[in-house]
Structure formats: C-alpha cells, structure tokens
C-alpha cells in the first residue's frame, strides 16, 4: 500500500544572524489525517517550534495556508534568527487519535546554522 | 482572466534535451501547486510532476533523474527541463495549476513534444 | 501508486439518456477524487471535485458520489456537448493518478 512520506528536501540551511530561515516539508499524501509539528532536536527533549493545530508562535509563518484541506505544503520561515537557534528542525506527522494525536512519521530533519551577522 | 500558455515542444532525437516553458496570468504561480501532466497521442492522462508553493518538488517514476520542474517568479512562469529524452516521452505535455495540490482547475492548451530519429 | 480502474472504457449513449461510469481505486482515497471531461485536441476540463463537487460553472446534469474505493460519475440527461473522454483522478497520494478513460460516443 502507499503511504505518506515527510520530505524535508534540505539537509542543512545556513542563514546570517538577523535573517529569516525557510525550512522546507512536504507530504507525498492527505491520508492519514492529523496535524504536523515542527520540533528542533529529537527525542524526548525535542523544542516544539511550530504546532498546525494550536498554540503562538509569533515568529513562525507558514508559505501554505494550511487550514486548507488539501495542503500538502508544510514549509515555514522563522523570522529574526539568531545563534541560539541553530540546530536540527524536524517536521513531524501525526495521526488524529482520541484523546490525543499519535506521531505518525518525521521527516529526515534540516540542520540549521547561524552565519554572524555581516559588519 | 486566469490563463496559461506552454510552448518549448517540438522534435527532438532520442537522447535529447527540451525545455518547456509555462507563462501564467491572472494569478501567480509561486502561491499555487502547479504540476504537468502529458497524454501520449491516442492515450490517456499520466501526470509527471508537481512544484509545490514551498519550491519542494515531486516526480513520476517514470521521469525521475530526467525532468526538473522549476519556476521563475519574476516572471510567472513553470519550466519543464526535459533530459536523456525517450521515444516513450512523446506526448503532448499540458501545465496545470492544482487547488492545493488536488484539482487540476486551469490547463494550458497543451504544448507537443515528439521524440524521434 | 494508486490504481484507478475506470469502467466502461467506452459507451454510446443517445441524448437524453442517463449516463453512468464508476471508478474504482487500488486503496482508500476517502473522498480525495476528481472528474474530467477532455474533448479531441483539446485540455481537459474539471467537472467535479472531492468526488461530489461540482465545479463553477459546471451544468447540474454532471454529478459525482462515492468514498473509500468506489466512485460513481452520472450525466443525467446526455446533451450534444457532452460526447467526450472523461476521467477519474485521485489527489490523496502522490504521484497523481488517472483512470483511464471512458469515452462517451453518439449511439
């Protein structure tokens, strides 16, 4: 059977202290439904960055609407990057379960590093 | 009016190399799924590949490591670059704009690519 | 992939007469699936969407049902302008897939 794939086409990104980062995901399927997450790191310790269901996250924009039912782009741009945000960003599927969604599958993650600011 | 227009088709040898250009108006391609699909002559509907609005790509089997879809937003338009060509890549290729991915809701008028000796 | 089967892959029909094709999909799609019309030398054209929606400007005699695996496509009352190739398409999974084909002739 088929079955959702995460691409997240970029190994790494660099990006200059002060700058957005675009940090690209990209599902291969609308099933299953569910919500996506974006976290820096992995594990049980990994920084939620981006939550498609609730939350603020002021310096996060989406390149997709993604209250649109068949979006399939994931992508988003943090804004204002500074060195404490380097690290590894995954973009993570989950599946809608009751009471709580289930993570379904994560993308292969994106390493981003912080260039000093140009003087 | 929303519009587009392919052109870049023609003949070319097996082995060959062509680039399809797609010049939309009325909306901009860079907030929109854009895929291309192609239909052999007498054949049915096969779509080859998709640019999502976040630049991620995605590829038929059939063309994979041989076709790159790209686009230019300065100048709205899609691009197919055609590689390593086929016999079996004759057909006439068509750019779409997707509805988020899955309606297929404005076509092009088709541009045709034969591959031939 | 996805394999959508379409049937019949060809029909006559007079004007007038009520028009049915089904498709039918290799897994669950829910009701990720789209209907076409293609005329001779011409792009395809969206008729329905997610199965039962119908396309602006599209007349009311085209419908679409189904979910899950099997899909119906109904002209209601055949008109001239209709005589076509229609086809199926599932959007719930890369890459695309078409059906294909049924075209509908003049008995």
């Known amino acids: 059977e088929d079955e959702l794939q995460v691409i997240q086409p970029e190994k790494s990104v660099s990006v200059a202290a002060g700058e957005s980062a675009t940090l690209r995901c990209a599902m291969t399927s609308l099933i299953p439904v569910g919500p996506i997450m974006w976290f820096r790191g992995a594990g049980a310790g990994r920084e939620l960055i981006y939550n498609q269901k609730e939350g603020h996250f002021p310096r996060v924009t989406t390149v997709s609407e993604l209250t649109k039912r068949n979006n399939l782009d994931f992508s988003i741009s943090i804004s204002n990057i500074t060195p404490a945000d380097a690290g590894t960003y995954y973009c993570v599927k989950f599946r809608k379960g009751s009471p709580d969604d289930v993570e379904f599958k994560s993308g292969a993650g994106t390493e981003l590093s912080v260039r000093a600011k140009p003087s | 009016e929303v519009q587009l227009v392919e052109s870049g088709g023609g003949l070319v040898q097996p082995g060959g190399s062509l680039r399809l250009s797609c010049a939309a108006s009325?909306?901009?391609?860079?907030?929109?799924?854009m895929s291309w699909v192609r239909q052999a002559p007498g054949k049915g509907l096969e779509w080859v590949s998709v640019?999502?609005?976040?630049?991620?790509?995605y590829y038929a089997d059939s063309v994979k490591g041989r076709f790159t879809i790209s686009r230019d937003n300065s100048k709205n338009t899609l691009y197919l670059q055609m590689n390593s060509l086929r016999a079996e890549d004759t057909a006439v290729y068509y750019c779409?704009?997707?509805?988020?991915?899955?309606?297929?809701?404005?076509w092009g008028q088709g541009t045709m690519v034969t591959v031939s000796s | 992939d996805i394999q959508m089967t379409q049937s019949p892959s060809s029909l006559s029909a007079s004007v007038g007469d009520r028009v049915t094709i089904t498709c039918q999909a290799s897994?669950?799609?829910?009701?990720?699936l789209n209907w076409y019309q293609q005329k001779p030398g011409k792009a395809p054209k969206l008729l329905i969407y997610d199965a039962s929606n119908l396309e602006t400007g599209v007349p009311s005699r085209f419908s679409g049902s189904g979910s899950g695996t099997d899909f119906t496509f109904t002209i209601s009352s055949l008109q001239p302008e209709d005589i076509a190739t229609y086809y199926c398409q599932q959007f719930a999974f890369l890459p695309l897939t078409f059906g294909g084909g049924t075209k509908v002739e003049n008995q």
């Open positions: 640019i999502y609005s976040g630049g991620s790509t």
């Open positions: 009325g909306f901009t391609v860079s907030s929109n799924y």
């Open positions: 779409a704009r997707g509805q988020y991915t899955g309606s297929l809701d404005v």
């Open positions: 897994q669950d799609i829910s009701n990720y």
